[in-house]
């Protein structure tokens, strides 16, 4: 009964995206004999782990094993048993864990250690859990979308296999929005990348790419909201915060201790004469937009051009895929269509934010109130970040494509991460018979 002598002609890989707000497990599949071809890996399953991000388990690490169980069991069901021991498992933690590490390296290590022990208990080829850098997160997201769009393939096609594909080989830029950070990654046009920290050089499938990337820690949608609240409560006359980023009639009590728990609000921290305050929504897009802009320091730039906070940003070039929370938020707001102009998006946001909270709750009865309440802020934040933060204009807005999936695979960093770690993106263009290769991303 030695099944190992007859391996299946497909392979699988598992990547867990341990984000700041939740963890998702992705299962990928590809034909074994075509490992070096571009575009052959596809996602067969996504399993969202029930509960918060792993950084929230810092005081209850013993619960991490149970937390991961359902999705790991799902992986055991989806992947044929004969493949389990050969299936690599990778966990990458992003900005939520970067923030925890900033607070305490020891606590971050403890969480990762328990995660590693839990995942190694499964019959897969566990390859480790680590906190990926913001630069990696940006780079792997860029690799993912361009791999799925067929941009690395040297064969020009007369037909389009994906809706965003133009037949040229010009890569798409990647815009990724998470809960705790946001990444912008693209190939600038004949532009020197003035800051070495933001420069990446790749050789993929025989072609060189000079890529710009930056990850803005604390500028994911959840941490940006905490920042905005911490900034605005500084000037509140009492424990009532009238907030234009929430619908009229919305009320929520916030603990000051929760507000100052994250390193992202440290710059706004002050001693307040109260332990709690109440957010009272007033639903005004323009005021919300103005408040958000105060989070972006645009007064200082040591380069020819900056995004914000003194971070170099070359002139925008080409088309961009905007994914993760960029997509989820805009999809909820029904603003992902290619035909919707930036002016139209702004108009829709003005109307949406002005809608009374009771009306919103009735219209979206199936949506959890915690998420529902934050779409006005999140939508406004996305516009502010893209327009004022990254300098998109009404004209260049049409180059932003809000992407959830490409060819059935989620846009995000996980596929690029796995392609790199499994050595499936060769530096040189493979011949029809795959060559042995030594240089990878």
């Amino acid at each position: 009964t030695q099944n190992k002598a007859l391996p299946e002609n497909v392979k699988y890989g598992i990547v867990l995206d341990a984000g700041s707000s939740h963890t998702s497990l992705y299962i990928y599949k590809w034909p074994a004999e075509k490992e070096n071809d571009t575009g052959v890996v596809h996602q067969v399953e996504e399993c969202r782990v029930k509960g918060p991000g792993i950084s929230k388990f810092v005081q209850k690490v013993n619960e991490i094993g149970i937390y991961l169980t359902d999705c790991m069991e799902r992986a055991r069901e989806v992947i044929p048993r004969s493949q389990h021991q050969e299936t690599p498992v990778y966990l990458g933690a992003t900005a939520g864990m970067r923030l925890l590490r900033m607070e305490s390296e020891e606590l971050a290590d403890r969480v990762l250690d328990v995660v590693e022990r839990s995942l190694s208990n499964y019959p897969f080829d566990f390859q480790g859990a680590r906190i990926i850098t913001g630069q990696e997160e940006g780079a792997y997201g860029w690799i993912t979308i361009n791999y799925l769009l067929g941009k690395f393939s040297q064969k020009t096609r007369w037909f389009s296999i994906v809706p965003y594909e133009t037949n040229n080989q010009e890569t798409f830029g990647a815009l990724d929005l998470g809960g705790a950070s946001t990444q912008v990654t693209f190939v600038p046009q004949n532009q020197t990348i003035e800051s070495p920290d933001n420069a990446l050089q790749f050789r993929l499938y025989g072609k060189d790419y000079n890529v710009y990337t930056h990850s803005f820690l604390c500028y994911g949608k959840d941490q940006a909201l905490w920042q905005k609240l911490a900034k605005d409560i500084q000037v509140a006359s009492n424990e009532i915060l009238r907030d234009p980023c929430f619908h009229p009639g919305y009320k929520k009590v916030v603990n000051v201790s929760d507000l100052y728990k994250t390193p992202c609000t440290k710059r706004f921290e002050m001693t307040l004469p109260f332990q709690q305050f109440e957010i009272q929504g007033i639903g005004n897009y323009q005021q919300c937009h103005q408040s958000i802009l105060e989070l972006f320091n645009t007064s200082y730039c040591p380069y020819s051009q900056c995004a914000f906070n003194g971070i170099f940003l070359p002139p925008l070039q080409g088309d961009f895929g905007a994914f993760s929370a960029f997509y989820f938020v805009m999809k909820f707001l029904n603003l992902t269509s290619e035909k919707v102009s930036q002016e139209k998006v702004t108009e829709m946001m003005k109307k949406f934010c002005a809608q009374p909270w009771e009306e919103i709750k009735t219209s979206y009865a199936g949506v959890k109130e915690k998420y529902l309440s934050e779409y006005c802020f999140s939508g406004t934040y996305i516009l502010s970040l893209l327009l004022q933060g990254y300098h998109f204009t009404a004209d260049s807005w049409e180059h932003i494509h809000f992407i959830g999936k490409i060819q059935g695979s989620d846009a995000g960093w996980t596929l690029g991460y796995m392609l790199n770690l499994t050595n499936m993106i060769p530096a040189e263009q493979p011949l029809s018979t795959p060559l042995s290769h030594s240089t990878y991303v």
């Epitope: 099944n3 190992k4 048993r81 004969s82 389990h84 190694s120 208990n121 019959p123 080829d125």
Partner: antibody, heavy 121, light 107 residues
Framework: EVQLVESGGGLVKPGGSLRLSCAAS????????MNWVRQSPGKGLEWVAE??????????HYAESVKGRFTISRDDSKNTVYLQMNSLKTEDTAVYYC????????????WGQGTTVTVSS | EIVLTQSPATLSLSPGERATLSCRAS??????LHWYQQKPGQAPRLLIY???QSISGIPARFSGSGSGTDFTLTISSLEPEDFAVYYC?????????FGGGTKLEIK
């Protein structure tokens, strides 16, 4: 012929140490997870430890009853798996079997003949 | 950890009779349940894996069934050499655990 041969058992005092060896032949040893299972006199079977492959960074797992006292290791160049037993207790007295699974995982289709460990003062 | 309870502890039957051995898991383990036979002075021998998969070289009279928490090993017509101790084993998750065993003796 697929074979596992254990050695190293014997009589040892409580608190003492012993190292068991298991020599494998007839299969590609480096490709398979290896395990130790024990059986106390007149009792049932108890899984003791597992060691995975080089590609799995030689990951190990242990039964709670031996954790911190026993160490499983392997030498792929010698086709041998070891069980280092420290701080031995009388309840560790058992026949120790070296086992593996040549098909899939977490069951045992190949067993050694066993080696007896007696812990007694 | 997953606890496996085997019943009966002892089963007395005559050659030619049908034997039904039971194994119950403390939580669902899908079909990750394996059966072994052990004779005195010998190492255990795998009979059935993944609840119902038969092993080459094992007589067809041995069959397994069940899924989730309840599993059965059936020997359709007992032969004299079948009288031994039978163990079930959790192959679902670590730590790997065995049932307490069922001793099948000649009546």
């Amino acid at each position: 012929e697929v074979q596992l041969v254990e050695s190293g058992g014997g009589l040892v005092k409580p608190g003492g140490s012993l190292r068991l060896s298991c020599a494998a032949s007839g299969f590609t040893f480096s490709k398979y997870w290896m395990n130790w299972v024990r059986q106390s006199p007149g009792k049932g079977l108890e899984w003791v430890a597992e060691i995975r492959l080089k590609s799995n960074k030689y990951g190990t797992h242990y039964a709670e009853s031996v954790k911190g006292r026993f160490t499983i290791s392997r030498d792929d160049s010698k086709n041998t798996v070891y069980l280092q037993m420290n701080s031995l207790k009388t309840e560790d007295t058992a026949v120790y079997y070296c086992t593996t699974q040549l098909d899939l995982y977490w069951f045992f289709d190949v067993w050694g003949q066993g080696t007896t460990v007696t812990v007694s003062s | 950890e997953i606890v496996l309870t085997q019943s009966p502890a002892t089963l007395s039957l005559s050659p030619g009779e049908r034997a039904t051995l039971s194994c119950r898991a403390s939580q669902s383990i899908s079909d990750y349940l394996h059966w072994y036979q052990q004779k005195p002075g010998q190492a255990p021998r795998l009979l059935i894996y993944y609840a119902s998969q038969s092993i080459s070289g094992i007589p067809a009279r041995f069959s397994g069934s069940g899924s989730g928490t309840d599993f059965t090993l059936t020997i359709s017509s007992l032969e004299p050499e079948d009288f031994a101790v039978y163990y079930c084993q959790n192959g679902h998750s670590l730590p790997l655990t065995f049932g307490g065993g069922t001793k099948l003796e000649i009546k």
